[in-house]
């Protein structure tokens, strides 16, 4: 007996599709070997029609696919547009030849079934509305009209013109005439459910002179669309339920045997398992919406359904769309930290992987917000201005060719805790979710800047020093001037570098930066940080105010600016780097649910570049002592 298993017989009708699942023993060899579907000939030869190696025969061109699902130890052969010529004996199997392990499958394709001559076939999806048309002769214009459903030999009345409605069709069936028409009546049945399927008879009049019409109603369950995604990648469910439910609450649910558990809906419900990694985006006024899930996990695999109902919950007889999501564990997306921890006043460096083939793509970092549908406004990007409230403390460092970029956020407060997304305008699968957890600091920060009240005077020499502990001895220390398009590294002088690492003196490890002579454009945020090659570590920030020699009042109270860096108060009192109003448009490119929107954000950021650049490191002159 063969260890391969599948349906022994499959029957269908012309024009239909079949999906044949073949099961194989769960071994590494079986998972990776060739899968095939062949047709058994009279001569005993089995002619390959489709295989997992990419072979597709002429007669299956454009109408068949073979998909391997190694995590289920199954493969599926989908064949569409069946004809009676497809009737025959087939094998589904594994191996380099068609003589390997296989299972015999018999496929029978019949003609579309014949109904009584005047039968009209209505095919509708679950939740939709059918309008059954019933013709009658003038002699029955004033007679009773009715629609009944055949149950064996009996025909049970669904609705009639005396206003009788079968309880199971209550509020769903209406009988009506249109305009001045004297020879047709109509029956609408809405919110169709599977048990509505069957043969109906509509009738005008009684006895032998009655006019009768037959209607065959087929109510189709939604055929799930198969989605095959990699672990840690993202998936977008595009849901188009039609205009009739445009004003109803929308939902996405995950099928769990009998029930369908809501993952997200437009009424604010969200499954905690998807916290921080889901967005629901309305697409238009016609009821279209999409749901994006990032950071896919193995347990996300399963059957999903989107729908609409005023309750925001699945309801029988309302339109739905279905998918089956498979999550491939052999992922190209690297495993990165999903939780990053920081302390108040400190900093975090978050590494964001991206598709290395797309090093020129625009990179972004956004903050997932748990409003009713979830949203992710961009905080920083390679060509996007830093969001208000993040000036001086957020920068994106692109490392072309490395397949990753780094986002640094310093002067942390507990309000920074939450979920953040790394994304690009390229390969949409490469979206990663990071949860940032900020705890109250219990000790002094590793990096400390002196003087803390940094006010420089134009034309003079100004030096600031950054004290670092011995644990950073071997790392590269740097100073950079923060601007809206990053933090530009400046020349600096490492005083600790002269000592041997063996006799490291905690008190004398200093990296200093000198502005000589100080210019007005030197005013702004400066960062002191440590890094090892492309790997960024701790940073601290200080605001340097610049004043005229003659005047005593600086542009901004430096104590206030740097107090934020040290004590991290909740309110923001920054006036520096104020931009023109037109630049604020690109700070919230709503929901990054598809590439189009990301692209727009990038384009817009590029437009704003010229007017939005709040200065660069070009005006700096650092000198070594």
């Amino acid at each position: 007996q063969s260890p391969i298993f599948g349906p022994q017989d499959v029957s269908s009708i012309e024009g239909n599709s079949v999906s044949i699942t073949c099961y194989y023993p769960d071994t590494s060899v079986n998972r990776h070997t060739r899968k095939y579907w062949c047709r058994q000939g009279a001569n005993g030869y089995c002619a390959t029609l489709i295989s997992s190696n990419g072979y597709l025969s002429k007669e299956y061109s454009g109408r068949a696919s073979l998909i391997n699902f190694p995590e289920n130890s199954t493969f599926v052969i989908n064949i569409a547009h069946l004809t009676q010529e497809d009737t025959g004996s087939y094998k589904c199997g594994l191996g380099t030849t068609n003589r390997g392990l296989f299972f015999d499958v018999s496929l029978e394709v019949s003609q579309v079934p014949e109904f009584p001559n005047d039968t009209h076939v209505y095919t509708k999806d679950i939740g939709r509305t059918v309008t059954i048309e019933c013709r009658f002769k003038e002699g029955n214009a004033h007679s009773k009209k009715s629609l009944c459903k055949k149950r064996g030999e009996a025909c049970e009345v669904v609705i009639d013109s005396t206003e009788y409605v079968d309880p199971s069709y209550k509020d769903r069936a209406i009988l009506f005439m249109k305009g001045t028409s004297r020879d047709i009546f109509y029956v609408n049945i809405s919110h169709l459910i599977p048990s509505d399927a069957g043969l109906y008879v509509c009738q005008a009049g009684e006895g032998p002179s009655a006019d009768k019409n037959n209607a065959d109603l087929q109510v189709l369950e939604p055929e799930p669309e198969l989605l095959y995604k990699d672990l840690r990648s993202s998936v977008t469910f595009e849901c188009d339920l039609g205009r009739e439910v445009a004003n109803d609450a929308k939902y996405l649910c995950r099928k769990n045997k009998e029930t369908c558990d809501v993952i997200i809906n437009t009424l604010g419900k969200r499954d905690p398992a998807f916290e921080g990694r889901i967005l629901l985006t309305p697409r238009d006024d016609n009821g279209r919406f999409s749901v994006l899930i990032t950071g896919l996990r193995k347990e996300d695999a399963g059957h999903y359904q989107c729908g609409a109902h005023s309750s925001g919950l699945p309801q029988e007889g309302w339109p739905v769309q279905a998918w089956q999501l498979f999550v491939n564990e052999e992922s190209t997306i690297p495993n990165s930290r999903s939780v990053v921890k920081g302390v108040t006043g400190g900093s975090v460096a978050i590494v964001c992987p991206y598709n290395p083939k797309e090093s020129s793509s625009l990179k972004y970092w956004c903050h997932w917000e748990a409003d009713e549908n979830g949203r992710c406004p961009v905080l920083v990007g390679t060509q996007a201005l830093v969001q208000e409230g993040y000036e001086g403390r957020l920068a994106l460092f692109d490392q072309p060719g490395s397949g990753a970029y780094t986002v640094i956020l310093n002067q942390l407060t507990t309000q920074d805790s939450g979920f953040y997304w790394c994304l690009t305008d390229g390969d949409s699968r490469w979206r990663t979710t990071i949860e940032l957890q900020v705890a109250e600091a219990t000790k002094k920060p590793d990096l400390e800047v002196t003087p803390q009240n940094a006010t420089a005077v134009i034309g003079e020499t100004f030096t600031i020093s950054c004290h670092y502990p011995c644990k950073f001895y071997s790392q590269e220390k740097y100073w950079c001037k923060w601007s809206n398009d990053g933090c530009h590294i400046l020349p600096s002088h490492d005083e600790g570098a002269r000592q041997s690492s063996v006799s490291c003196d905690q008190s004398s490890q200093i990296v200093s930066m000198t502005l000589n002579p100080v210019k007005k454009e030197d005013e702004g945020w400066y960062w002191c940080g440590v890094k090892e090659g492309q790997v960024y570590g701790e940073t601290t920030a200080i605001y340097v105010a610049v004043e005229e020699r003659t005047r005593g009042s600086p542009h901004i109270n430096p104590t206030d600016a740097n107090a934020r860096a040290k004590d991290a108060p909740e309110e923001e009192a920054m006036e520096s780097s104020v931009r023109e109003d037109e630049n604020k448009a690109n700070l919230d490119p709503r929901l990054f649910a598809d590439e189009r929107e990301i692209q727009n954000a990038g384009d817009q950021a590029q437009e704003n570049r010229a007017s939005g650049n709040a200065g660069s490191a070009g005006g700096q002159s650092g000198s070594s002592k």
Epitope: D9, S12, I13, S17, I20, V112, Q218, L220, N256, K257
Partner: nanobody
């Protein structure tokens, strides 16, 4: 609540035939798949046959290895009934036959874990 009721079991001579019925009742029964299993005294429950249909005239029929063309699973015109026609019966077919249905989508139809509703079973005895 969904209920599955088997009928049609009984005593039959080797080489004879029986037709088992499985009738489903309950408002929430909307399964598009039904399986038959059997359990002989002192043995594990084993897969006999499974039928899965789509609303568009497409049906998939699965059978256990031992069936070898002797049994046929089918669906009644009343969509809540499934039959198992058993021909050329052998003494080793003696067992309690159970019908089962899943609540939703199903993985491997041979696995008892995939089914949520079970009938009480009907006894088939094949004498030699």
């Amino acid at each position: 609540e969904v209920q599955l009721v088997e009928s049609g079991g009984g005593l039959v001579q080797a080489g004879g035939s029986l037709r088992l019925s499985c009738a489903a009742s309950g408002r929430t029964f909307s399964s598009d798949a039904v399986g038959w299993f059997r359990q002989a005294p002192g043995k594990e429950r084993e897969f006999v046959a499974h039928i899965h249909w789509s609303g568009d005239f497409t049906t998939y029929y699965y059978y256990g290895d031992f069936v070898k063309g002797r049994f046929t699973i089918s669906r009644g015109t009343a969509k809540n009934t499934v039959y198992l026609q058993m021909n050329s019966l052998k003494p080793e077919d003696t067992a309690v036959y159970y019908c089962a249905a899943p609540k939703g989508a199903i993985g491997d139809p041979r696995s008892t874990r995939e089914y949520d509703y079970w009938g009480q079973g009907t006894l088939v005895t094949v004498s030699s």
